[in-house]
């Protein structure tokens, strides 16, 4: 193993990470020295993990602390042995305090599951350390949770099947350890953007994995294929959901962050994207009537092409709390687009455009926009993202999504943008013009557009309004209306029917 230890700046703290390497510095020195040095004023040895049963939606309420072997607090605080029990597990912390997302999640769980037990696993003393040390403590914390669960199982009516561990960042791997160490199998683990550093590529027993619970679902919101990935990139659950490709989250760009605060930094962007997993989960709890659907796909690029909007053979699922158990799958990667804020739901459409002739295109890819007109609403002007290139005499597939429910689609306006948007495109246009001076008229022909709704699984074909006019050129538009054969529906199930 290489001796070079990369220095990693995460948020405003620089720390070294190298598994097992002693790191002599950190916030206010080595915290474990403080925690384990005998003090004259602190003689009692306290467990490093506390279990706080949140007995009220009031975030300021102190709740009840549970400890193994002490049954009285369970009675005093009305712990419901037959109800669902949620364990919320926080991650690494720089401040040593619970972050704001915590009470949002607690409150959402109480709102959705009124009789449930909501327990916050407080491992702040072990998490408020150098990242490497916090990572090394995850196993210990997992053991503590497993011990608590083993003790609860001794009680009448308590079932591990009713236990749902929800772990954020480093807490997701803590949940994995807990599920691994407990006697029996917990019902569910949800990993909210599980931590990447020191876990990416790790052995199955040293990170969250599908073996850790009856059902393991994961949301990945801060993965990076270049630079540091704060969240783990690899799939680690039965289903692994990558909203917006699992990397750049809408509303979290530097511009968005700068817009909302005077001194926006990369810190806020990182926090926003990493924490987005929590908010997507909260959204699934409180906006039950607006579920977001994810679609199985081999990779993000194929999803961006609109190829993967199928619900056949369990290829789509609700995200977050409403996800349907899929134990037969492992490491199934699923994708979706989202809005920038709650409710996050969008409506996905696959657009298949058959280009049957293609004149004088040169090197430059055209920029297309579509506007969808529906019975409920009309969309904004939506860009057609060209992932590779426009193919001639072939069907080109695109993904578009709208923030509102348009209802049944009635017509489509396709626009080819005239003016180039970048100097690079302008240069390519100029070169193209020089190389083809006698064929200035760029044009392509489209007869029909086939549209499939991801949410309803309905398919519809749109034909040009004027069958004689199928050509489109820069700065022009082409209108399409529902073809006479109307809605064409295959034997594909709608996610709204299939999912709970």
């Amino acid at each position: 193993m290489s001796n070079s230890v990369p220095l990693l700046c995460f948020w405003s703290l620089c720390y070294c990470f190298a598994a097992g390497s002693p790191v002599p510095f950190g916030p206010e020195g080595r915290l474990e020295d403080k925690l384990h040095k005998p003090k004259a004023t602190q003689t009692e040895v306290k467990p490093s993990v506390r279990f706080n049963l949140r007995t009220s939606k009031d975030p300021e309420h102190e709740g009840c602390y549970l400890s193994v072997g002490h049954s009285q607090p369970l009675e005093d605080c009305s712990f419901n042995m037959t109800a669902k029990t949620f364990f919320i597990i926080h991650g690494w912390t720089m401040s040593g305090i619970f972050e704001n997302w915590l009470h949002k999640l607690v409150s959402a769980l109480h709102t959705r599951e009124k009789d449930a037990n909501v327990v916050v696993v407080d491992w702040l003393p072990l998490a408020h350390q150098l990242y490497t040390d916090a990572v090394n403590n995850t196993r210990v914390v997992g053991h503590s949770i497993a011990r608590m669960l083993d003790w609860l199982q001794e009680k009448d009516d308590f079932s591990l099947g009713n236990v749902h561990l929800i772990g954020y960042s480093l807490g997701a791997h803590v949940a994995g350890y807990a599920g691994n160490f407990v006697k029996g199998t917990v019902g569910r683990i949800t990993g909210l953007d599980p931590a990447g550093p020191m876990f990416e590529g790790a052995d199955i027993h040293k990170r969250l994995s599908p073996d850790d619970a009856d059902f393991v679902d994961v949301l990945h919101t801060y993965t990076r294929s270049f630079g540091l990935s704060i969240g783990i990139q690899m799939p680690v659950g039965h289903i692994d959901i990558y909203p917006n490709g699992g990397d750049f989250q809408p509303g979290c760009g530097l511009n968005d962050v700068l817009g909302s605060i005077a001194y926006g930094t990369i810190t806020e962007v990182v926090k926003c994207e990493h924490e987005r997993a929590v908010h997507l989960f909260v959204d699934s709890l409180v906006n039950q009537d607006k579920p977001s659907f994810a679609f199985q796909c081999t990779d993000s690029n194929r999803f961006k092409k609109g190829i993967c909007l199928s619900c056949r053979k369990n290829r789509c699922n609700s995200i977050g709390y409403n996800a349907k158990k899929m134990r037969n799958k492992r490491n199934s990667k699923m994708y979706l687009k989202t809005r920038a804020g709650m409710p996050f739901r969008v409506y996905h459409y696959q657009m298949k455009i058959h280009v049957f002739s293609y004149k004088n295109m040169g090197e430059i890819e055209p920029t297309f926009y579509v506007t969808l007109y529906g019975t409920n609403a009309d969309s904004q002007t939506l860009p057609l993202e060209i992932v590779e290139r426009i193919e001639q005499n072939a069907t080109n597939t695109f993904l578009v999504y709208t923030e509102e429910d348009l209802g049944d689609l009635l017509k489509i306006q396709l626009t080819w943008e005239g003016a180039s948007q970048s100097w690079y495109n302008l240069w390519k246009e100029f070169r193209s013009y020089l190389s083809q001076p006698r064929n200035p008229g760029r044009e392509l022909n489209i007869r029909r557009i086939r549209v499939k709704s991801g949410e309803t699984q309905r398919k519809l074909t749109f034909c040009t309004e004027d069958p004689e006019n199928t050509s489109i050129s820069p700065g022009r538009e082409l209108w399409f209306r529902k073809c006479r054969d109307g809605w064409r529906m295959k034997n594909e199930t709608s996610p709204t029917v299939e999912l709970p």
């Epitope: 306290k46 975030p59 602390y65 619970f98 009470h103 702040l124």
Partner: antibody, heavy 120, light 112 residues
């Protein structure tokens, strides 16, 4: 009822050490964090940092790193603020104030304050 | 660090009238629909006392003539109708996520 009772006024010379206490009653001491706040004469409030009353881990703001130390005597439900190598600019009233670990971290109960005068 | 700027530094209000104190933050103190801004009252020789938490929630035992509003970076404390016993210095404080948590410079209210 909930109370935070601080030790009495202190008169010290520069270079000396002072230890101010804050005794809590009426609630479970380890279930709430304890803050320390400085108020120089005729000035506003300045947050110094806080201590986790369960783990004993202190957190200091940049201006209060070095000569300042937060500590606990959990069995006596008491938090302490110690200032070493006192300087004239440490002359102020020091308050302890609790906050909930959960929720929005406002300071709901305060000690009556301890006036520290540093003068040669 | 988030800087809180209170205005005015001092104000004199007649008995029964409205007192309005403003607090501007250098960056947003909101988090997912909640504002992490709080208001305290401090009388001479006494510790501060919590009046309003999370921008607009009245602490128990505080008279209803005190109210708070605002979101993002702009917050207001209103006292109406002002009473004699309201003469004090008022401080805003933010506790949005990672410390340091900060206080505004204070506004001294005098009753005419």
């Amino acid at each position: 009822q909930i109370q935070l009772v601080q030790s009495g006024p202190e008169l010290k010379k520069p270079g000396e050490t002072v230890k101010i206490s804050c005794k809590a009653s009426g609630y479970t001491f380890t279930n709430y964090g304890m803050n320390w706040v400085k108020q120089a004469p005729g000035k506003g409030l300045k947050w110094m940092g806080w201590i986790n009353t369960y783990s004993g881990v202190p957190t200091y703001t940049d201006d209060f790193k070095g000569r300042f130390a937060f500590s606990l005597e959990t069995s006596a439900s008491t938090a302490f603020l110690q200032i070493n190598n006192l300087k004239n600019e440490d002359t102020a009233t020091y308050f302890c104030a609790r906050f909930s670990y959960y929720g929005r971290h406002y300071f709901d109960y305060w000690g009556q304050g301890t006036t520290l005068t540093v003068s040669s | 660090d988030i800087v809180l700027t209170q205005s005015p530094a001092s104000l004199a209000v007649s008995l029964g009238q409205r007192a309005t104190i403003s607090c501007k933050a250098s960056q947003s103190v909101d988090y997912d629909g909640d504002s992490y801004m709080h208001w305290y009252q401090q009388k001479p020789g006494q510790p501060p006392k919590l009046l309003i938490y999370a921008a607009s929630n009245l602490e128990s035992g505080i008279p209803a003539r005190f109210s708070g509003s605002g979101s993002g970076t702009d917050f207001t404390l209103n006292i109406h109708p002002v009473e004699e016993e309201d003469a004090a210095t008022y401080y805003c404080q933010q506790t949005n996520d990672d410390p340091p948590w900060t206080f505004g410079g204070g506004t001294k209210l005098e009753i005419k």
